[in-house]
Interface confidence: medium
């Protein structure tokens, strides 16, 4: 080994070197949080870039650049360092027009913390491994969601458009004339029944166990779906989104109540199956895979 390489190895393995890099990254992060940084911070930026360049040079001299098994670019963590340095010089010395977009990449410097702190490195490694292992579970999840989305599509297509429509129309009004003039939320409130504080018209259904309309209102299929049109089973994609919402239990009880009011209480069976299979089983299966990957990484 050449003397330069020997010195580089000694520096690289020294604990103070790791400490210096860690402190530099943390200080750099603090400076990045500044809203309106003063002019002198520009010089500090150059200092940080210089330290990162020095770190990479030491690593390259000690391990080699890319030829060989344990060289600098063979370690994916060093790719991050390399990208950080390249962007640092690009934003500083090359006029690329929209520099602010490139300056966003400075945030990558914060990610350098991962490669320096061993515990974080393990967690991120486990995360990457779990993503690889999750592919099968994800395929199963998407398949299950798709199957239930298709069932939902068949059972509830158009149901969430059922609304309680006012019977006592003016003599010259017709359903068509009303639908042509409905523009604002106020227009809707004039013809449909709204519960106190509700932003959507009262849902109803045509089966005996579905929601009924109050006196003076008739259940009709008209207008848009609830929640600004985002909650429905009218197409496969909307049904899939609704099923994903059930799986993640994202305000799922509202979707459950809306659907049961429009379709009938019998359909609670559908929701019980979806919640048990999707929310309890599949979510825990995903968690189990992540836990296994983390355990493997630790060993």
């Amino acid at each position: 080994f050449s003397p330069l390489r020997r010195i580089s190895i000694k520096i690289l393995v020294h604990s103070l070197f790791s400490m210096l890099i860690m402190c530099t990254i943390l200080t750099n992060c603090i400076f990045m949080t500044m809203n309106n940084p003063p002019d002198w911070t520009k010089n500090v930026e150059y200092t940080f870039t210089g330290i990162y360049t020095f770190e990479s040079l030491v690593k390259i001299l000690a391990r080699g650049f890319c030829v060989g098994e344990f060289t600098f670019l063979r370690d994916p963590w060093n790719w991050l360092d390399f990208v950080v340095i390249v962007f640092a010089y690009l934003t500083e010395f090359v006029n690329l027009g929209n520099v602010s977009a490139l300056r966003t990449f400075r945030v990558l410097r914060a990610l350098k913390t991962i490669s320096v702190i061993p515990g974080l490195k393990t967690i991120v490694g486990a995360l990457i491994q779990s993503v690889k292992k999750l592919s099968d579970v994800m395929i199963l999840t998407v398949f299950c969601l798709s199957v239930f989305a298709l069932i939902g599509l068949q059972l509830f297509m158009g149901n969430l458009k059922h609304k309680c429509f006012r019977n006592s129309l003016e003599n010259n009004e017709t359903l068509e004339s009303i639908m042509n003039t409905l523009e604002s939320e106020e227009d809707f409130r004039k013809y449909f029944y709204y519960l106190e504080g509700s932003k959507d018209a009262l849902l109803c259904g045509f089966s005996t166990d579905s929601g009924q309309c109050p006196e003076g209102y008739t259940c009709v299929k008209i207008g848009r779906n609830p929640d600004y049109g985002y909650t429905s089973f009218d197409t496969f994609s909307w049904a899939f989104l609704a099923l994903f919402r059930l799986m993640t239990q994202d305000y799922w009880e509202n979707l459950y109540q809306q659907t049961l009011r429009a379709a009938g209480k019998t359909y609670m069976i559908f929701f019980v199956v979806v919640i048990f299979l999707g929310s309890f089983y599949l979510i825990n299966l995903i968690l189990a895979v992540v836990a296994m990957a983390y355990e493997e990484q630790n060993q």
Partner: nanobody, 124 residues
Framework: EVQLVESGGGVVQPGGSLRLSCAAS????????MRWYRQAPGKQREFVAR???????GYADSVKGRFTISRDQAKNTVYLQMNSLRPEDTALYYC??????????????????WGQGTLVTVSS
């Protein structure tokens, strides 16, 4: 497909009575309001009477006190009892209904449907 069929029209003398009926058929889930309209030769269609899902009624000023609208929910039928008929009541009488029905493919549709009309002639 939802169909509205009017019946009961005919020729009647002034001061006489007639009872028109309008029956809705098809895969009907619910009927909202039902209305009667009329169109005299060379004139525009005008509103006659209406009945809501809750059986509230409304009439045109020209027929108030003479005509009575009623409905049979079970038979999906609306009736128009016309008393003290006048020559100016001569027209083709149509019924209109807001119907929610199950259409092809099992989907549900709401819309207003019209009958073909029944002719009422009041003349001596």
């Amino acid at each position: 497909e939802v169909q509205l069929v009017e019946s009961g029209g005919g020729v009647v003398q002034p001061g006489g009575s007639l009872r028109l009926s309008c029956a809705a058929s098809g895969r009907i889930l619910r009927i909202g309001y039902m209305r009667w309209y009329r169109q005299a030769p060379g004139k525009q269609r005008e509103f006659v009477a209406r009945i809501t899902g809750g059986s509230a009624t409304g009439y045109a000023d020209s027929v108030k006190g003479r005509f009575t609208i009623s409905r049979d929910q079970a038979k999906n039928t609306v009736y128009l009892q016309m008393n003290s008929l006048r020559p100016e009541d001569t027209a083709l009488y149509y019924c209109e209904a807001l119907v929610t029905a199950s259409v092809r493919g099992g989907s549900i549709h709401s819309g207003t449907y019209w009958g073909q009309g029944t002719l009422v002639t009041v003349s001596s």
